[in-house]
């Protein structure tokens, strides 16, 4: 067991051109805070994957207001360290994500607003108990300077916090076979409970007599470094001579991940993907709960009030992400129906509807014909958000108010002549054609193509189109 400690030294514009504007202003004062997320191993993981080693939020920094016209300086920082406790052995290799958040203190609807300013990530090797390691990371135009270390919590000592120390029972020396605990020379190693010969640097045990290896080490006593370059299979146990992993039982056999964690094999060992609210190599440690205030942007934390349960953030409209940290482009979900225009006003979503549609999402098709009269015996037809009149013969236009010239469209085929008639139009067909629109040729034997001429009409007579 132990604690990972992170000390932020400065956060401000990086060197070079294109200095960022200050995130705060006289109109919008703000303050910073930081979040650190730790994961075991050197895996390149997405920012959203669980912080299996743990996570921590800093306190809020002092309120800062930009001086008009001044370049963005290093911004005032929160006091104190970010501390991430770990219950298991320190893995030696780890990945980190450090996020810089801005809390806007203007007159925000619903309380302060949070936004992510910068996120840096890295993969490091670190022995517990060592000195502070200094680091500089850049995210866009911002630069973050920080130091970190891992320290063991008594009675644990060693580079992995797996050796146990106890106060000396005698003032001058430790008991038989027990060494002084460097650097705590006034303490002694506790009696060994691991398997005899288990490497004190690279092995640890949770049960008497066992010897479990830290990442990168193998063998019954964890004394053989893993070399994957000449190995055929990523499974143990190890061949003591080459250090290669040879086929054997899989590290995920029996699922070592607690609390519903899912196990995945890695080239050297296994990794647990923990459900929200749990962390540790085997998901055995409960992590962030509602008491840590993990929900940003007005999100409500649901569940997790007791230390052993996970939390869920119910995000207000316009935000998403496991911590409500991401602003949603709500219009990208195309909520406005029937071709409505979407407007995201921040506090609400609005749809500007096309003619003929109404409702919050333009979901209501208005009765296009309501109150619309079609003149001269025309009938109203709904459709597409606009009314349309189907006009009686001899009339046209949007409302059937225009007297139509039925011959304007040249309706008579094959050279037939068109005559306007009070009830429509009449086609006088050219020789050899018949039909209402002169569309049918008359066959040489006198028989016409379908349809037959109506009784009382000879081919070539004018055909009245009623």
């Amino acid at each position: 067991a132990g604690v990972f400690e992170l000390q932020i030294h400065s956060f401000g514009p990086g060197p070079g051109p294109g200095a960022p504007r200050s995130p705060c202003s006289a109109r919008l004062p703000c303050r910073l805070f930081f979040r650190v997320c730790l994961k075991p191993g050197l895996s390149e993981e997405a920012a959203e994957s669980p912080c299996a080693l743990g996570a921590a939020l800093s306190a809020r920094g002092p309120v800062y207001t930009e001086q008009p016209g001044a370049p963005a300086p290093d911004l005032p920082l929160p006091d104190g360290l970010l501390q991430v406790p770990f219950r298991d052995a320190w893995p030696g290799t780890f990945s980190f994500i450090i996020e810089t958040w801005r809390e806007e203190l203007g007159d925000q609807i619903g309380g302060p607003a949070w936004s992510l300013l910068a996120r840096v990530a890295g993969r490091r090797r670190l022995a517990a108990g060592g000195p502070w390691a200094r680091d500089i990371q850049r995210a866009g135009a911002w630069e973050l300077r920080f130091s970190y270390r891992a320290r063991c919590e008594p009675p644990a000592v060693g580079t992995a916090c797996t050796r146990l120390c106890r106060p000396r029972s005698a003032p001058s020396r430790c008991g038989p076979g027990l060494r002084p605990c460097a650097p705590l020379e006034d303490e002694c190693e506790a009696p060994l409970v691991c398997r005899a010969g288990c490497s004190p640097e690279h092995g640890f045990c949770e049960q008497p007599g066992e010897c479990r290896c830290l990442e990168g080490w193998t063998g019954p006593l964890c004394t053989v470094p893993v070399s994957t370059s000449s190995c055929l299979s990523p499974r143990g146990p190890s061949s003591a001579t080459t250090g290669c992993l040879v086929p054997g039982p899989g590290p995920c056999d029996g699922n070592p991940c607690a609390n519903g964690g899912s196990c995945s094999e890695t080239p050297r060992s296994f990794e647990c993907t923990c459900p929200r609210g749990f962390y540790g190599l085997r998901c055995e440690v409960s992590g962030v709960t509602c008491a840590d205030g993990p929900c940003f942007n007005g999100g409500l934390c649901v569940g997790g009030a007791d230390p052993d349960s996970a939390y869920i953030c119910h995000c207000p409209p316009g935000f998403q992400g496991s911590n409500c940290e991401k602003r949603v482009d709500r219009c990208s979900l195309q909520p406005c129906r029937n071709g409505g225009l979407c407007l995201d006003l921040g506090h609400a979503l609005r749809c500007r509807c096309r003619a003929g549609f109404a409702g919050p999402r333009c979901e209501h098709d208005l009765d296009d014909c309501a109150g619309r009269a079609c003149a001269n015996g025309g009938t109203c037809v709904e459709g597409g958000g606009a009314h349309r009149c189907s006009c009686a013969l001899g009339f046209g236009g949007r409302d059937c108010r225009e007297r139509a010239d039925p011959c304007a469209a040249r309706p008579c085929a094959h050279g037939g002549r068109c005559y306007a008639h009070f009830s429509g139009l009449v086609c006088a067909c050219a020789p050899g054609y018949m039909g209402a629109r002169c569309e049918f040729p008359v066959h040489p034997d006198g028989a016409s193509a379908l349809p037959a001429a109506p009784p009382g009409l000879r081919p070539g007579d004018p055909q009245r189109y009623l």
């Epitope: 609807i109 619903g110 309380g111 940003f296 007005g298 934390c301 649901v302």
Partner: antibody, heavy 118, light 108 residues
Framework: QVQLQESGPGLVKPSETLSLTCTVS????????WTWIRQPPGKGLEWIGY???????NSNPSLKSRVTVSLDTSKSQFSLNLSSVTAADTAVYYC????????????WGQGTMVTVSS | EIVLTQSPGTLSLSPGERATLSCRAS???????LAWYQQKPGQAPRLLIY???SRATGIPDRFSGSGSGTDFTLTISRLEPEDFAAYYC?????????FGGGTKVEIK
Amino acid sequence: QVQLQESGPGLVKPSETLSLTCTVSGDSISNYYWTWIRQPPGKGLEWIGYIYYSGTTNSNPSLKSRVTVSLDTSKSQFSLNLSSVTAADTAVYYCARVFNRGFAFDIWGQGTMVTVSS
Amino acid sequence: EIVLTQSPGTLSLSPGERATLSCRASQRISNTYLAWYQQKPGQAPRLLIYGASSRATGIPDRFSGSGSGTDFTLTISRLEPEDFAAYYCQQYDTSPLTFGGGTKVEIK
């Protein structure tokens, strides 16, 4: 101007289900979370539960097994069902709109008194 | 759940005086997600303050909120006749959403 109006029976028999509806006018029901709160006579306020058009709901654990909150976007209404009522459920029931940047309640209905009695 | 305790239960003051109402949480409210409401007899509550210190739309500036963590305060700088009512605090940091028991501000 957003307005909320509660409706439902004012008298419910013990062991029956209390059913109330809140009609929202003046804004889209899809833009906000919507909630129910109650206040027994002469006492303080108690949150019952909320709903969002996406289907997200949450309710007070002290009532959870008895509470159902639902929403009908087409009618711009949301509803409360509280089953197995007793005299202790007698209260003024309020519907309210949830703030868009935090779960405070910025617009309230005028409230409806529900008495549980045989 | 977070239990909110309001004090005093009743505050007897005269118009023009300063009123200070307290709301104490049983555990830390992480994000200053605390609201204050005013309720007059026979009416629904009205939101006064959100985010511990921001006034809601249309609320006079004699109402102010402060505090963080577990201790929050609503101050009415000069009581007007219409301010005599019951006042409730509510936290919206962690579910279940909870209200305080209320403080009644009455005319002395």
